[in-house]
């Protein structure tokens, strides 16, 4: 469940370099790009994963309407600054000294500025809405079966406690998974909803981050659930601060 001793690999993060140089010759794994030691018994933080990715060689009615403060990650990939615990630093800057503030999932929540921009605190993303469209099927999935399988998936594959899966909505072909996790609810050792959502997003794209484990094979009563597109909305504990010109 930790770094696999026999062949010294990290089951939960293939973007690592592992060697038996830990205490007592134990297998220890470090994230690519940052060299930070990771805990292979749980998900690696999104910040460290993005950093590793940037360092790697390039090769309706029951549905929720995201509110006006919901953020979508439109900026794409960037090489983030992570703190010693692997969390995103509140302020991110690129090589041209353009800076912006991010939330706990690394999504920009302010206009871009210069090096004088201040980001006082890392604002927590406490509500994530994963919006999926599945490929056409002969008939709609049974909602309660779909709900059960998705909750089990998040528990067993991403180790996210079911209490953080607030709801699963379904109107064929759209599935929405709501993850909620306030600062006060997250105990030591709990997987962060942002990390679980990122692993899920990569799984759905066929880019699994797990080592040796098969890709995502999601079935509902034996019927494959194949995802055509994914859109993820992020809601922060404090609404984002964008100027009016961005909204026009």
């Amino acid at each position: 469940h930790t770094a696999a001793q026999d062949n010294c690999t990290c089951p939960t993060n293939k973007m690592t370099v592992c060697s038996p140089d830990g205490p007592g010759g134990r297998c220890q794994c470090r994230a690519l790009g940052s060299g930070v030691a990771v805990d292979c018994s749980t998900l690696t933080s999104k910040c460290l994963l993005l950093k590793a990715r940037m360092s790697a060689p390039k090769n309706a009615r029951t549905l929720v309407r995201p509110n006006e403060h919901a953020l979508v990650d439109n900026d794409g990939l960037y090489d983030p600054d992570c703190d010693p615990e692997g969390r995103f630093k509140a302020r991110q800057c690129n090589q041209t000294s353009v800076c912006w503030c991010v939330n706990s999932v690394g999504v920009r929540r302010t206009d871009k500025g210069d090096l004088s921009l201040r980001c006082d605190e890392l604002v927590r993303t406490h509500h994530i809405l994963i919006d999926l469209r599945h490929r056409p099927t002969a008939s709609a999935f049974n909602h309660s079966d779909l709900d059960a399988e998705l909750r089990r998936l998040f528990r067993e594959r991403y180790r996210l406690h079911p209490k953080f899966v607030a709801a699963v909505h379904y109107e064929q072909p759209t599935i929405q998974i709501e993850l909620r996790q306030n600062t006060s609810q997250k105990a030591a050792g709990d997987v962060d909803i942002g990390d679980a959502a990122y692993y899920f997003e990569r799984d759905v794209k066929g880019e699994s981050l797990f080592q040796g484990r098969g890709g995502l094979d999601l079935r509902v009563r034996g019927e494959p659930l194949q995802v055509e597109r994914t859109l993820i909305y992020y809601l922060d504990e404090i609404p984002p601060k964008f100027s009016m010109k961005r909204l026009t």
Epitope: H1, S144, A148, E149, R152, E156, R159, H161, P162, K163
Partner: antibody
Framework: QSLEESGGDLVQPGASLTLTCKAS????????MLWVRQAPGKGLEWIGC???????TYFASWATGRFAISKTSSTTVTLQMTSLTAADTATYFC?????????????WGPGTLVTVSS | YDMTQTPASVSAAVGGTVTIKCQAS??????LAWYQQKPGQPPKLLIY???DLASGVPSRFKGSGSGTEYTLTISDLECDDAATYYC????????????FGGGTEVVVK
């Protein structure tokens, strides 16, 4: 913290029966609750599970359709069994996971005996 | 995810050692527990995550293994260790017949 099962009885083949598991000293919502049975002189057999938050249920392949699990109050979970046969004669245990995302059962009730016989 | 436990019964003298094996039909990523059960009582969690001792369990009980192969070793056997021991995969509850192994009866002479 404790669990206690009730509702075990002697019933006729084909009958239905509902067992109740009462939890004390902890918040059910933070756990999964599981039912396990043990026929006389035999091993442990997993029946099913409920994620209290969300209410989703999961069953061993042999138990699907004939068994149902539900949360009936803030402190109780039930196991409903239908079309009982002699093979269902067993001590039925309810158990709680450890609050993590694995299914380690660190709290068990003493069990309740169900006998199916004509 | 079937769990095969061997042997069904084992006997050893006080102070001796017994070894119980458990094989999973697929990789369970060390999410394995061992339980001790005495007659008329519910099972008691001994070991989780394949090798971690549950609270209050003496260090004479040792779990090991990874992938599909796991072992419980009880050393310095005491009379009180006479019981039936079960392994359980704690990885998934999806599409399984039983999460538990068949059990091993330990007789202490």
């Amino acid at each position: 913290q404790s669990l206690e099962e009730s509702g075990g009885d002697l019933v006729q083949p084909g009958a239905s029966l509902t067992l109740t598991c009462k939890a004390s000293g902890f918040d059910l919502n933070n756990y999964a609750m599981l039912w396990v049975r043990q026929a006389p002189g035999k091993g442990l057999e997993w029946i099913g599970c409920i994620y209290i938050s969300g209410g989703t249920t999961y069953f061993a392949s042999w138990a699907t359709g004939r068994f149902a699990i539900s949360k009936t109050s803030s402190t109780t979970v039930t196991l409903q069994m239908t079309s009982l046969t002699a093979a269902d004669t067993a001590t039925y245990f309810c158990a709680r996971d450890d609050g993590t995302t694995s299914y380690y059962l660190n709290l068990w009730g003493p069990g309740t005996l169900v006998t199916v016989s004509s | 995810y079937d769990m095969t436990q061997t042997p069904a019964s084992v006997s050893a003298a006080v102070g001796g050692t017994v070894t119980i094996k458990c094989q999973a039909s697929e990789d369970i990523y060390s999410l394995l527990a061992w339980y001790q059960q005495k007659p008329g009582q519910p099972p008691k969690l001994l070991i989780y995550d394949a090798s971690d001792l549950a609270s209050g369990v003496p260090s004479r009980f040792k779990g090991s293994g990874s992938g599909t192969e796991y072992t419980l070793t009880i050393s310095d056997l005491e009379c009180d260790d006479a019981a039936t021991y079960y392994c359980q995969q704690a990885y998934t509850i999806g599409n399984i017949d039983n999460a538990f192994g068949g059990g091993t009866e330990v007789v202490v002479k």
